[in-house]
Interface confidence: low
């Protein structure tokens, strides 16, 4: 089933992200949404990311025989983020432009930040209903990629162990205990 409607929004949330994080820092970003400064505070490697495109998508879910009773609304994170220097004196002499052009093997991309798991009911042709679990994106963020990262990760940001799919226990109905949920 095709999307019935897609509405493009632009994220105006300012998210400071280190431009040269260590690999560990990159992984940790997935846990806190990238909202942190480098250890040295605001230095010349700190960038503010704006312009992350959040596409609101409305679609029906099908498993081939059954179709969702109501359409599903979710966010689709798209596009590259526009990098802007944090400190005002970076803007004047074209330094920022040169800085970024020298790093053509790097790019900032808009990727999934937060997800929520929910249950949806599908109506079947024979009158019965089925319930499925799905994960929908609820927020986007900017993430720095290198060309090597792109090739090795198959373009799946959340393939990194820092941002796995939620523990199965968390995907169960709310009436069940959540003692096994991941920290």
């Amino acid at each position: 089933f095709k999307n019935d409607a897609t509405e493009i929004l632009y994220s105006h949330v300012v998210k400071p992200v280190p431009a040269h994080p260590s690999s560990n820092s990159t992984l940790n970003q997935a846990r806190n949404g990238g909202r942190h400064f480098s250890n040295t505070g605001l230095d010349r490697n700190t960038r503010v990311q704006v312009g992350c495109r959040e596409l609101r998508s409305t679609k029906y879910i099908s498993d081939g025989q059954c179709t969702s009773i109501s359409p599903l609304k979710e966010l689709v994170c798209a596009g590259e983020c526009l990098p802007l220097p944090v400190l005002p004196n970076w803007i004047g002499g074209g330094y920022g432009t040169k800085y970024w052009s020298r790093r053509s093997s790097q790019e900032w991309r808009c990727v999934n930040d937060k997800t929520r798991t929910q249950r949806i009911q599908l109506q079947c042709q024979d009158g019965s209903t089925r319930t499925y679990k799905i994960t929908v994106v609820t927020a986007c963020k900017c993430k720095r990629y290198t060309r090597q990262h792109n090739e090795s990760s198959h373009n799946f940001e959340s393939m990194s162990p820092a941002k796995p799919v939620q523990h199965h226990r968390e995907r169960k109905r709310a009436s069940k205990s959540s003692k096994h949920s991941m920290s």
């Epitope: 099908s62 081939g64 679990k133 929908v136 994106v137 799946f156 959340s158 799919v165």
Partner: antibody
Framework: QVQLVQSGAEVKKPGSSVKVSCKAS????????ISWVRQAPGQGLEWMGW????????RYNRKFTGRVTITADESTSTAYMELSSLRSEDTAVYYC???????????WGQGTLVTVSS | DIQLTQSPSSLSASVGDRVTITCQAS??????LSWYQQKPGKAPKVLIY???NLETGVPSRFSGSGSGTDFTFTISSLQPEDIATYYC?????????FGQGTKLEIK
């Protein structure tokens, strides 16, 4: 009707890798968990891991950590399972399966026989 | 990992018989137990999920019950087409695990 169609049988040498594909049709691929389950000849079923196609998020059985990689290509509605450092005991039929809401498997691929032999 | 112990490992019964297979978990699995039927050379097929729910299209002679750690799968009246191996599977904790299987034969 949902269908999961897997790639053909493979014969591999010990130490090599194998990549099995699973093409889904008839459903919304991005909103599904695809698991991989294997079955050695005459043996039971063993869950290897899953991928959530919408985000690429994965979880693996600890037994296979470091050797198995599950990926997905939304554009072709295809999931992949790659197993490296193959040994003779990896000889098995490998199934992809689509999860229902609470972790049972509603649809299965036809299976791919991987034979590891020198 | 949660261990599932199925019994018996094999059984022989006559057409029309009531057949019972048990599955014991090494810890409470909160009723997240499903049952599969597998015929030779074929992929497994889910019959029962969440302990007692019959999957769409599965004959009503198949049923499941239990709670906590002890679960039972029943075929109320065995049919020739029921000859297969049956597996239980827990989905309460990762990794998902299966019982070792029960091979069902006709006398």
């Amino acid at each position: 009707q949902v269908q999961l169609v897997q790639s053909g049988a493979e014969v591999k040498k010990p130490g090599s890798s194998v990549k099995v594909s699973c093409k889904a049709s008839g459903g919304t691929f991005s909103s599904t968990y695809i698991s991989w389950v294997r079955q050695a000849p005459g043996q039971g079923l063993e869950w290897m891991g899953w991928i959530y196609a919408g985000t690429g998020g994965t979880r693996y059985n600890r037994k296979f950590t470091g050797r198995v990689t599950i990926t997905a290509d939304e554009s072709t509605s295809t999931a992949y399972m790659e197993l490296s450092s193959l040994r003779s005991e990896d000889t098995a039929v490998y199934y992809c399966a689509r999860e229902g809401v609470d972790g049972w498997f509603t649809y299965w691929g036809q299976g791919t026989l991987v034979t590891v032999s020198s | 990992d949660i261990q599932l112990t199925q019994s018996p490992s094999s059984l022989s019964a006559s057409v029309g018989d009531r057949v019972t297979i048990t599955c014991q978990a090494s810890q409470d699995i909160n009723n997240y137990l499903s049952w599969y039927q597998q015929k030779p050379g074929k992929a497994p097929k889910v019959l029962i999920y969440d302990t007692s729910n019959l999957e769409t299209g599965v004959p009503s002679r198949f049923s499941g019950s239990g709670s906590g750690t002890d679960f039972t799968f029943t075929i109320s009246s065995l049919q020739p087409e029921d000859i297969a191996t049956y597996y239980c599977q827990q989905s309460d904790n990762l990794p998902y695990t299966f019982g070792q299987g029960t091979k069902l034969e006709i006398k």
